[in-house]
């Protein structure tokens, strides 16, 4: 009976999400393997988040709006492990917008989701950021490693969206 009611709840939750995400990929987790954590298909998952790489070339503001429409934000990178996971799926000759910007050019960097900007957990390439006119951040491959660079916000780039996993 308990299992039946849990299944019914799950199905109704799935139907609720179906209007936003036509297809979800879910995995069982939790100590009794009773919880399902889901990401929209074909997003990838890492820890408690889902990631989508957009190959559409757009400005930073349009890229963020595009993520927002999908219930996400441009990616906020919190750890080196998270960055290493994300970069596995990136092309080394491309650049991708992050959810990091400095709109006034005062070198006051801010994450789109209001996560505090911690200088000690940043992965800028050597010598970056280097221009107050370059107010948006990308991740790209340079000098044999992935890192961040400040660029003009209006210049179209690919982007990475991030959202919390859906639990059902």
């Amino acid at each position: 009976n308990f299992m039946y009611s849990k299944t019914v709840k799950r199905l109704s939750k799935l139907q609720e999400y179906q209007q936003y995400y036509p297809s979800l990929t879910c995995v069982m987790e939790g100590k009794d393997m009773e919880d399902w954590s889901c990401c929209p298909t074909p997003w990838t998952s890492f820890q408690s988040s889902c990631y989508f790489i957009s190959t559409v070339m757009q400005s930073w503001t349009k890229s963020q709006n595009n993520c927002s429409v999908m219930g996400a934000d441009l990616v906020v990178i919190n750890t080196k492990e998270e960055q290493d996971f994300i970069t596995q799926n990136l092309k080394i000759n491309s650049a991708y917008f992050l959810g990091l910007s400095d709109p006034k050019g005062w070198r006051h960097w801010q994450w789109v989701d209001q996560t505090p900007y911690n200088k000690n957990v940043t992965f800028w390439h050597s010598g970056e950021p280097n221009s107050p006119d370059e107010r948006c951040a990308i991740i790209n491959f340079r000098s044999e490693e992935w890192g961040w660079n400040d660029v003009h916000c209006h210049v179209p780039q690919k982007s990475i969206c991030k959202m919390k996993k859906i639990y059902i």
Partner: antibody, heavy 121, light 111 residues
Amino acid sequence: EVQLVESGGGLVKPGGSLRLSCAASGFTFSSYGMSWVRQAPGKGLEWVSTISSGDSYTYYPDSVKGRFTISRDNAKNSLYLQMNSLRAEDTAVYYCARQIYYDYAYYFDFWGQGTTVTVSS
Amino acid sequence: DIVLTQSPDSLAVSLGERATINCRASESVSFRTSHLMHWYQQKPGQPPKLLIYGASNLESGVPDRFSGSGSETDFTLTISPLQAEDVAVYFCQQSIEDPPTFGGGTKVEIK
């Protein structure tokens, strides 16, 4: 006082080439992105090309891509526009303009007086 | 590309009265509190001159009879009271995304 002075315009036959120059003074030229904007006779403004302050970034509309090249010489405080394979529809006054960044975008705060390019056989 | 449509194409206003020019973008040129539309004035035989940046900020040295407002896709330039020296063509411009684009212009004359 900020000054932008364009030169190099003139009459050229279709298929010909011209090189426009813009001499900048009164500001630290190397710190600013610059653009060329044109205005056909009796028409509106059309952006032609942009170059970033350190010249790492250049951008063109499809209408001139592959024919026009923007460049700069920060040591000479000069901006250039090399125009090849000119067409009748390139006839316009060409302005150089200084870019100022504002939040996620930019505007043009100073413009030169313009130089006239006429493409005609 | 973002298309900017200005209206009207021209308008005649009496001296001392209010002139209102509209600019509509084909998609939003705002992001949160940043409204990324700018306005220029061009008098015959002269280059454009910046009047307003960021939808509502008056450029230094521009008389305060010029004002701008708007957000997202709809923006307005207002001149009040109109003076004889305001006879010109006015252009809106966006650069939130390359390529930067201009409106087609609005010619302001004295009635």
